[in-house]
């Protein structure tokens, strides 16, 4: 008789999840020699231990602490780039601007990027059929709690000027319910962070509006100011040209506004 299995509303664990996490860990240490001390088998064991045999709606930050400890990494605190709803461009930027880091440029972020995972209470099985959806099922699921934990730690580590890339094509350029809006903004440390600088990325070729005047940006400014952190905002009218100018800053066309 097949065992009854909880049906969740979200997609199941990414196929080859254990193999992918382990492979990513080894790849990360290969391309970041300063992280070669990391034992990837121990990292996988700690990752697995955070959610295996646990109810996937009852995961806590505490569950991830062994993994957080193994993945401890020092990134330059003044070179942090946060992003919201514009991951690809943020990653293209840090690929060119090698001294800046998104969360996914750190070991733990790299391990979990674009993956889904969950287990089942009281069995050592990984659930490849379905996992809890944040809205429809529960917020304390393995994936959401992981990103909340690493995002909080990443924001807490930031100092000086922190940059955030925001998607100007969305109805809510700043969304209080995003990871940036609900976690990172509230965990920037005012005693360390002087300024949050928002880069609003325009989508349309002919879009010349000043999106820094958008009501949601004003809302972000208000939240940040109340936390005793300065706020500044820049429009990035031409993201393609922006990246090109990061690559080749001496190009003559890079003096004009981008």
């Amino acid at each position: 008789v097949p065992r009854w299995r909880q049906q969740w509303s979200g997609p199941g664990t990414t196929k080859r999840f254990p193999e992918t996490v382990l492979a990513r860990c080894v790849k990360y240490t290969e391309i970041h020699p300063e992280m070669r001390h990391v034992d990837c088998q121990s990292v996988w064991d700690a990752f697995k231990g955070a959610f295996i045999s646990k109810h996937p709606c009852n995961i806590t930050e505490e569950d991830y602490q062994p993994l957080m400890k193994l993945g401890t990494q020092t990134v330059p605190c003044n070179k942090i780039l946060l992003w919201s709803r514009i991951k690809d461009l943020a990653h293209q930027f840090t690929q060119v601007q090698r001294d800046m880091f998104t969360l996914e440029d750190t070991l733990l972020g790299y391990l979990a990027d674009d993956l889904t995972w969950c287990g089942e209470f009281n069995t050592s099985k990984i659930n490849y059929q379905s996992c809890p959806d944040w809205r429809k099922d529960c917020s304390n699921n393995p994936v959401s709690v992981f990103w909340k934990t690493v995002s909080r730690r990443f924001a807490e580590a930031a100092c000086d000027v922190v940059h955030v890339m925001l998607n100007g094509s969305r109805s809510k350029i700043f969304d209080k319910n995003s990871t940036f809006g609900s976690v990172e903004v509230h965990n920037l440390q005012p005693e360390k962070v002087q300024t949050l600088e928002a880069w609003v990325i325009h989508g349309g070729r002919e879009d010349s509006r000043d999106l820094c005047q958008d009501p949601t940006i004003k809302e972000l400014e208000s939240i940040i100011s109340k936390r005793n952190i300065q706020f500044s905002c820049k429009n990035i009218y031409r993201p393609d040209k922006f990246l090109q100018c990061v690559k080749n800053p001496e190009d003559s066309s890079c003096t004009s506004e981008i």
Epitope: E19, A23, R24, V26, K27, E30, P33
Partner: antibody
Framework: QMQLVQSGAEVKKTGSSVKVSCKAS????????MHWVRQAPGQALEWMGW????????DYAQKFQDRVTITRDRSMSTAYMELSSLRSEDTAMYYC?????????????WGQGTLVTVSS | AIQLTQSPSSLSASVGDRVTITCRAS??????LAWYQQKPGKAPKLLIY???SLADGVPSRFSGSGSGTDFTLTISSLQPEDFATYYC?????????FGQGTKLEIK
């Protein structure tokens, strides 16, 4: 079994570009960093750069920074190395290579090599 | 970039001889060193990784030692198929670098 199969020999004119391919089989392409190494006739091996096939992220040796581009096609499990503004000193055997994850970060697997000849 | 200096650049030896090739790094590379064998017209073959670990399928007459800046590849009893060029490589940090090679010839 694990194989890296490279494209055939190329003869190129000075100032032109060459694009060498490396088709991977027998393993999950995105699980391993792919490196490119070259060897001029009678010379030592020279590391050129790497690509993470999963994300397309790259890093290059400073010497080649302005002239080399490493890309990949995930659907074809193939990595590419393009070298531009060719000069006679670029005449060499070009290899793709990867580690085994169990052998430190030494290159346990190599393509058969692609000879690129640059003539004026 | 880390420089690797191999010595000798060439050597002649006979079948059955014990042969030692050295590789010196310009800075500490811990044990992040590999040794390769290359025959004419062929791709290099990994012999030793992490300075002293034997790669799969490599005969036990090959051994590696050393850490830090000084490393050695030893072939305990030369066989006819061992006549080739040998390279050391550091993977401690980027850019990865190789030694200039040691050509092992039949005496």
């Amino acid at each position: 079994q694990m194989q890296l199969v490279q494209s055939g020999a190329e003869v190129k004119k000075t100032g032109s570009s060459v694009k060498v391919s490396c088709k991977a089989s027998g393993y999950t392409f995105t699980d391993y960093i792919m490196h490119w190494v070259r060897q001029a006739p009678g010379q030592a091996l020279e590391w050129m750069g790497w690509i993470d096939p999963e994300y397309g992220r790259t890093d290059y040796a400073q010497k080649f920074q302005d002239r080399v581009t490493i890309t990949r096609d995930r659907s074809m499990s193939t990595a590419y190395m393009e070298l531009s503004s060719l000069r006679s000193e670029d005449t060499a055997m070009y290899y793709c290579a990867r580690s085994a994850h169990t052998t430190g970060f030494g290159f346990a697997y190599w393509g058969q090599g692609t000879l690129v000849t640059v003539s004026s | 970039a880390i420089q690797l200096t191999q010595s000798p650049s060439s050597l002649s030896a006979s079948v059955g001889d014990r042969v030692t090739i050295t590789c010196r790094a310009s800075e500490d590379i811990y044990s992040n060193l590999a040794w390769y064998q290359q025959k004419p017209g062929k791709a290099p073959k990994l012999l030793i990784y992490d300075a002293n670990s034997l790669a799969d399928g490599v005969p036990s007459r090959f051994s590696g030692s050393g850490s830090g800046t000084d490393f050695t590849l030893t072939i305990s009893s030369l066989q006819p198929e061992d006549f080739a060029t040998y390279y050391c490589q550091q993977y401690n940090n980027y850019p990865y670098t190789f030694g200039q090679g040691t050509k092992l010839e039949i005496k």
